[in-house]
Amino acid sequence: IWELKKDVYVVELDWYPDAPGEMVVLTCDTPEEDGITWTLDQSSEVLGSGKTLTIQVKEFGDAGQYTCHKGGEVLSHSLLLLHKKEDGIWSTDILKDQKEPKNKTFLRCEAKNYSGRFTCWWLTTISTDLTFSVKSSRGSSDPQGVTCGAATLSAERVRGDNKEYEYSVECQEDSACPAAEESLPIEVMVDAVHKLKYENYTSSFFIRDIIKPDPPKNLQLKPLKNSRQVEVSWEYPDTWSTPHSYFSLTFCVQVQGKSKREKKDRVFTDKTSATVICRKNASISVRAQDRYYSSSWSEWASVPCS
Amino acid sequence: RAVPGGSSPAWTQCQQLSQKLCTLAWSAHPLVGHMDLREEGDEETTNDVPHIQCGDGCDPQGLRDNSQFCLQRIHQGLIFYEKLLGSDIFTGEPSLLPDSPVGQLHASLLGLSQLLQPEGHHWETQQIPSLSPSQPWQRLLLRFKILRSLQAFVAVAARVFAHGAATLSP
């Protein structure tokens, strides 16, 4: 058993049929010595008396808010949560496996630049009695500070018969050094509590590996005289690291109709303009990627050909 | 060329060669990006590689103030990786595929380090840790880790030379 926060404790249980469970001793936070009784949740049934209460925790019915009283007055609470371990593996029932970029990916994180700011998100089908707490650091043995905000519900989607909820959190490295080569990864830890179930999820990454620039901005077209060709120009996204002579992007320019199966014109460039062939009912799209490190491409920025 | 006396390197040549190094480092192991090597433990094996750190003056302001600190750090790293790629980690079993770009990568690391430090000038170089994995699978894992680390190192070096070519060239 360990303390998650004040008056909230996590009991780690091997979860299998007829498991013996864990013996837990609760102590009432009071100078009083006698006349103390214990109850669980809203029940008035007295579970025991005395300053300590010893319980065998085997299942969710044994978890919950234990309260010690004296003469009708509440003295203190202890909330017991369960953390299940099945076949040596901690349960991951609360969050959905996003399966990208690989199986058992529960947390996904992205950064728009090298400033040390990043966003992580996760998915669940649970809509109520759900809380998250996020901590982060750079490195684990001698951790350096990363400050995370509160996790918030950022999107709701319908997936077949189920509703899916997306939560996200923003974090900022306290003393970021955008130009340095990272040697220690960022660690992100998410505590998830659903009713009386506790789970924790972690992710470890370098900012450079989660970079995904915003799409290029201000796409403009200029038709070339006596030609089917069009000069398309754009600018670096505002959120990208500066100066651009140091933090350079490379671009992919594509002309395609509405369907992905249609024919296309495609060219790669390090410049902020390119010449392509425009077709009626097609769009010109441009996306960006770090020029020197193969992290994710941005989403496309598009303008119609006409 | 960057020499201990402090003259400027051939920024544009260094830019071209460092960008080539980036391409080669990724083609040497493109799939490394999809492996989470941190899960494989054994972190100390690549902790000894020289990293370009915050105080090394490789940021735009540091380059403007005095690029020599940064160039020396890059030079150390190039020599370090060049030796690693020539060591039995890469030459031993399992043999590299015949079309592996590691050979080209090795030669390009040497080429860029020579651009930075001509014959007759010597910056101190970092000792190579004795990494002699006994098992072929350990060697394979170590190669992945070294290439992964090299990808990050050459990305920073390429930014430095691109910025230098754009803003510091005479």
Partner: antibody, heavy 118, light 107 residues
Framework: QVQLVQSGAEVKKPGASVKVSCKAS????????LHWVRQAPGQGLEWMGW????????EYAPKFQGRVTMTTDTSTSTAYMELRSLRSDDTAVYYC???????????WGQGTMVTVSS | EIVMTQSPATLSVSPGERATLSCRAP??????LHWYQQKPGQAPRLLIY???QSISGIPARFSGSGSGTEFTLTISSLQSEDFAVYYC?????????FGGGTKVEIK
């Protein structure tokens, strides 16, 4: 599968014109760009231009501008390349090729030998 | 127009050996570079597109690398059917242009 079959060899006199055909099969004709590339005997490859069968848009290499015309007949899935004012140095194998991507050449015809000789 | 330069013009290699073919552009063309193989009396065949992207059906011994101005086609272990002429082609700008070719012959 995608296939391009070209017309047979031609012998022409200097100053004449030649029209080479290229019949496509195995795909929807308007879904691919069509290019023409030529190769003089013992020489390298030379791009001549492209046509979009969907709308008849064309782009020709400056070297051939004014002397070449590329057309298509969607009813027969056939592309044509006409080269006028032939000279002896136009003697070459002329290839048509098709691709969904505009700037490189995926599927090639077998080639048509055009000999220009007096 | 962009004039592409291939080297060497002829490469003599023994079967089973590795062949490295070079293609240079006079200015940066990013990764807008494609490789073709042509055997005598046949049409060219696309091997690699956008510098390093492999084509299904093309043996894995063919690989491409490079970006900017320098590109390489590597044939890791030459088979008898690989002796042919190889062309690079830039697609950075129109007109599309080819290199002069490298003939890979049996040593």
């Amino acid at each position: 599968q995608v296939q391009l079959v070209q017309s047979g060899a031609e012998v022409k006199k200097p100053g004449a014109s030649v029209k080479v055909s290229c019949k496509a099969s195995g795909y929807t004709f308007t879904d691919y760009y069509l290019h023409w590339v030529r190769q003089a005997p013992g020489q390298g490859l030379e791009w001549m231009g492209w046509i979009d069968p969907e709308n008849g848009d064309t782009e020709y290499a400056p070297k051939f501008q004014g002397r070449v015309t590329m057309t298509t007949d969607t009813s027969t899935s056939t592309a044509y390349m006409e080269l006028r004012s032939l000279r002896s140095d136009d003697t070459a194998v002329y290839y048509c090729n098709a691709n969904k991507e505009l700037r490189y050449f995926d599927v090639w015809g077998q080639g048509t030998m055009v000999t220009v000789s007096s | 127009e962009i004039v592409m330069t291939q080297s060497p013009a002829t490469l003599s290699v023994s079967p089973g050996e590795r062949a490295t073919l070079s293609c240079r552009a006079p200015q940066s063309i990013s990764i807008n570079l494609h490789w073709y193989q042509q055997k005598p009396g046949q049409a060219p065949r696309l091997l690699i597109y956008f510098a390093s992207q492999s084509i299904s059906g093309i043996p894995a011994r063919f690989s491409g690398s490079g970006s900017g101005t320098e590109f390489t086609l590597t044939i890791s272990s030459l088979q008898s059917e690989d002796f042919a002429v190889y062309y690079c082609q830039q697609s950075n700008s129109f007109p599309l242009t080819f290199g002069g070719g490298t003939k890979v012959e049996i040593k």
